[in-house]
């Protein structure tokens, strides 16, 4: 029962984590304009892995994709790669773990096979989580480095752009989503690995021994214990996520033409 619960919980935690990694990768708020000690601008800049956006005080938001590949900083490319690898590994891990779940019966699949699949998916989740954490951390380090540099915009020269206004960028919401999501995927992977140990049939290092007592003989054969409890908790996971960047004057989000006050 405990093994099944651990496996199921590991799967759910990993699922949430991978959904978070995907969300973080797609989010535009990896870095947001630093408003502390800055002149209050009527425009708010924020940047993601794939595009940079500007939200005007008027509410008009304009996003531009990074249409160049060679012009991008190597670090940004590395972060993209880490996040994509994390998503791919996580997705494969989820696929494998679905078939490995003890509560799901697929033909006459042996417990040993399910144990191996559980371990495989667990390792994949751990690596996926580490990739996401590494990617987010590399980006955060890049931001910190750029924050103190005189050329405040970390994408100076990208796509032929020339930096003239000193705009400093700080951590965006996506970084925190990424760290948490990576951590959850990692925890889920560890839980899957722990569950794998309990799923594997116990192999004994000794053979059956016959004891001959006076009068009658009884043979004791140590056998493996097999849990037959099913995992029946219907866990519905709904991820509510708001990736809106907030400025110093904003108090709430609202579905109007502009969300900047």
């Amino acid at each position: 029962m405990a093994v099944t619960a651990c496996q199921g919980l590991g799967f759910v935690v990993s699922l949430i984590g991978i959904a978070g990694i995907i969300a973080a990768t797609c989010m535009d708020q990896w870095s947001t304009q630093d408003l502390y000690n800055n002149p209050v601008t009527a425009v708010f800049n924020y940047q993601g892995l794939w595009r940079s956006c500007v939200r005007e005080s008027s509410g008009f938001t304009e996003c531009r994709g990074y249409f160049t590949l060679l012009g991008l900083p190597a670090m940004l490319q590395a972060v993209r790669a880490l996040m994509i690898v994390g998503i791919v590994l996580g997705a494969i891990g989820l696929l494998v773990s679905i078939f490995a779940l003890k509560c799901i019966r697929i033909g006459s699949m042996e417990d040993s096979a399910k144990a191996n699949m559980t371990l495989t998916s667990g390792i994949m989740f751990i690596v996926s989580g580490l990739c996401a954490i590494a990617g987010v951390s590399v980006f955060a380090n890049m931001l910190v480095t750029n924050f103190w540099m005189s050329t405040a915009n970390m994408y100076t020269g990208m796509g032929g752009m020339v930096q003239t206004v000193q705009t400093r960028y700080t951590f965006g919401a996506a970084l925190f989503v990424g760290w948490v999501a990576g951590g959850l995927t990692l925890i889920g992977g560890v839980m899957m690995c722990i569950a794998c140990r309990g799923l594997a049939p116990e192999e004994t290092n000794y053979k059956a021994v016959s004891y001959h007592a006076s009068g009658h003989s009884v043979a004791y054969k140590p056998g493996g214990f097999k849990a037959s409890t099913g995992f029946g908790s219907n866990t519905k996971n709904k991820k509510i996520y708001d990736g809106g960047a907030r400025t110093e004057d904003e108090v709430q989000s609202y579905p109007s033409k502009h969300d900047y006050v």
Partner: antibody
Framework: EVQLQQSGPELVKPGASVKMSCKAS????????MHWVKQKPGQGLEWIGY????????KYSERFKGKATLTSDKSSSTAYMELSSLTSDDSAVYYC???????????WGQGTSVTVSS | DIVMTQSPSSLTVTAGEKVTMRCKST????????????LTWYQQKPGQSPKLLIY???TRESGVPERFTGSGSGTDFTLTISSVQAEDLAVYYC?????????FGPGTKLERK
């Protein structure tokens, strides 16, 4: 058609207060910031501040903090500006203007003339 | 606060003439995020409300005649009227639309010769 209709001229005594209105029509009132601008006779334009009609968030120029109070009424699509402790320096035409692309004020009211005189 | 200066303060023109007026800001109005200059030009005729002519330094507002052209970047901007018409006689204001408080230039008055 977008229109900003402002209230009529005001003649007030020094030290008094005045509240002027700006009724919006032809667009979603809560979807745009409403800015207010002052223009003294024969002089240039001076930004007072803005109100976000959606959540009543405001931002004021330092010069007008404590002088101007911006409010809005969603039900009537009207923005208001109240000026307190009036002096002769407050005699001017006050405009309301809608903010759009490029942080540009694309539609302006006809202006409310305020004359402070004893 | 950003200070906007305009030159000349007044211009005497004749119909059909090409007119250029300048606007200077104490800080760059170029936003790095979208490479747009947040400078706006308004026209105010006597006894009327200001009218939007150009935003983003060079984007003409719909309905504004093509003879009005905005240019410049950073701190230096220009409004050009290729062929002045009688109805263009007005005061032209430039405005910083990048930093709060939003600030206007003192204006350039276009007068008939």
């Amino acid at each position: 058609e977008v229109q900003l209709q402002q209230s009529g001229p005001e003649l007030v005594k020094p030290g008094a207060s005045v509240k002027m209105s700006c009724k919006a029509s032809g667009y979603t009132f809560t979807g745009f910031l409403m800015h207010w601008v002052k223009q003294k006779p024969g002089q240039g334009l001076e930004w007072i501040g803005y109100i976000n009609p959606y959540n009543d968030g405001t931002k004021y120029s330092e010069r007008f903090k404590g002088k101007a109070t911006l409010t809005s009424d969603k039900s009537s699509s009207t923005a208001y500006m109240e000026l307190s402790s009036l002096t002769s320096d407050d005699s001017a035409v006050y405009y309301c203007a809608r903010l759009d692309y490029g942080n540009a004020m694309d539609y302006w009211g006809q202006g409310t003339s305020v004359t402070v005189s004893s | 606060d950003i200070v906007m200066t305009q030159s000349p303060s007044s211009l005497t023109v004749t119909a059909g003439e090409k007119v250029t007026m300048r606007c200077k800001s104490t800080q760059s109005l170029l936003n790095s995020g979208n490479q747009r200059n947040y400078l706006t030009w308004y026209q105010q005729k006597p006894g009327q409300s200001p009218k939007l002519l150009i935003y983003w330094a060079s984007t003409r507002e719909s309905g504004v005649p093509e003879r009005f052209t905005g240019s410049g970047s950073g701190t230096d901007f220009t409004l050009t009227i290729s062929s002045v018409q009688a109805e263009d006689l007005a005061v032209y204001y430039c405005q910083n639309a990048y930093y709060y408080p939003l600030t206007f230039g003192p204006g350039t008055k276009l007068e008939r010769k």
